[in-house]
Amino acid sequence: PGPPPGPPRVSPDPRAELDSTVLLTRSLLADTRQLAAQLRDKFPADGDHNLDSLPTLAMSAGALGALQLPGVLTRLRADLLSYLRHVQWLRRAGGSSLKTLEPELGTLQARLDRLLRRLQLLMSRLALPQPPPDPPAPPLAPPSSAWGGIRAAHAILGGLHLTLDWAVRGLLLLKTRL
């Protein structure tokens, strides 16, 4: 006879799994808010700043009520990957003005990366279909000026803040339905 069977694989408690993801998301949300406030203090900027390469915001009126877990996690992962790429780009090409936001931008990048790995783990633990590998994204053009880099930073941090809020609200709402 072969070796005795191993212990049965414990299926994860989806609420606990979601919980730890929400925790990381909330923590990153607080970091992002703080960094955005720091940026506003150093480089005040009026009005909304947009960057065409950023993902469009995930939520529209009424959409939260119809959310399903696979859709939320897939969309969130795709959007956060884009933000990670933009934060990396900002650190590399943002110019000397944005060096004043280090080491905080570096910490934000590391935490964003950690949340992405956590989402990947959650999706595999919950046996959700894995999204296909992302096609290589075209490189982001360097900002045209120092002020262009600052405007981009406002857009990136503002968009990330809203995306993380959408994520926390969506994930907590889904948790109530589990």
């Epitope: 919980d19 925790l23 998301t25 909330r26 923590s27 949300l29 607080a30 808010r33 909304d48 915001l57 995930a58 939520m59 529209s60 009126a61 009424g62 959409a63 939260l64 803040h161 809203l162 993380l164 809020d165 959408w166 926390v168 609200r169 907590l172 709402l173 948790k175 109530t176």
Partner: antibody, heavy 119, light 111 residues
């Protein structure tokens, strides 16, 4: 000065609807969520739901799902709460409150709108 | 939903005394480093006012005599030396999960 100013008191019949407004000033309207809280006489405060003014997506306490509708007019920096199929238990003071994104604590409150439901 | 129980229901103290208000949650509202409990003060005919957020952070414009502490399921609001204007009703609120809920309140009265 950061302020939330709500519409005036309302008296409604059972089965009717009421729509309360909340005008924000002194801050960037889209930087915070707008939450709504009910305070009925002798009852604890009750969270109704919130809305993200930037994206317009509301979420509700299950207790109020289907009867409360939260909307915003970004251009007017105004949030609205409509409550339908009113009953006597809806008699309360309703507050709008500015909510920190993702954390649900409320650092600025409107003055409250009294809604009385009576036949 | 998480239930918050405040004690005592009412408390009579004199100006200058120390007030200790308690809030107990039906399950833990803390997760590594964050405690999702907030405290408000409400006076008759007025809206609530945020005093403390995330268990121990003083809200803007709130006097330093107010402080918050605790983790897990047990939290405390302390007023180190009561002033006349502190006599009011105090509520705790959690935001650990949806929906956020409030305690039933502690009424602080002048002795």
């Amino acid at each position: 000065e950061v302020q939330l100013v709500q519409s005036g008191a309302e008296v409604k019949k059972p089965g009717a609807s009421v729509k309360i407004s909340c005008k924000a000033s002194g801050y960037t309207f889209t930087d915070y969520n707008m939450d709504w809280v009910k305070q009925a006489p002798g009852q604890r405060l009750e969270w109704i739901g919130d809305i993200n003014p930037h994206q317009g997506g509301p979420i509700y306490n299950q207790k109020f799902t289907g009867r409360a509708t939260l909307t915003v007019d970004k251009s007017a920096s105004t949030a609205y709460m409509e409550l339908s199929s009113l009953r006597s238990e809806d008699t309360a003071v309703y507050y709008c409150a500015r909510g920190e994104l993702g954390h649900w604590y409320f650092d600025v409150w409107g003055q409250g709108t009294t809604v009385t439901v009576s036949s | 939903d998480i239930v918050l129980t405040q004690s005592p229901a009412s408390l009579a103290l004199s100006p200058g005394e120390r007030a200790t208000l308690s809030c107990r949650a039906s399950k833990s509202v803390s997760t590594s480093g964050y405690s999702y409990i907030h405290w408000y003060q409400q006076k008759p005919g007025q809206a609530p006012r945020l005093l403390i957020y995330l268990a121990s952070n003083l809200a803007s414009g709130v006097p330093a005599r107010f402080s918050g502490s605790g983790s897990g399921t047990d939290f405390t609001l302390t007023i180190s030396s009561l002033e006349e204007e502190d006599f009011a009703t105090y509520y705790c609120q959690h935001s650990r999960d949806l929906p956020p809920t409030f305690g039933q309140g502690t009424k602080l009265e002048i002795k």
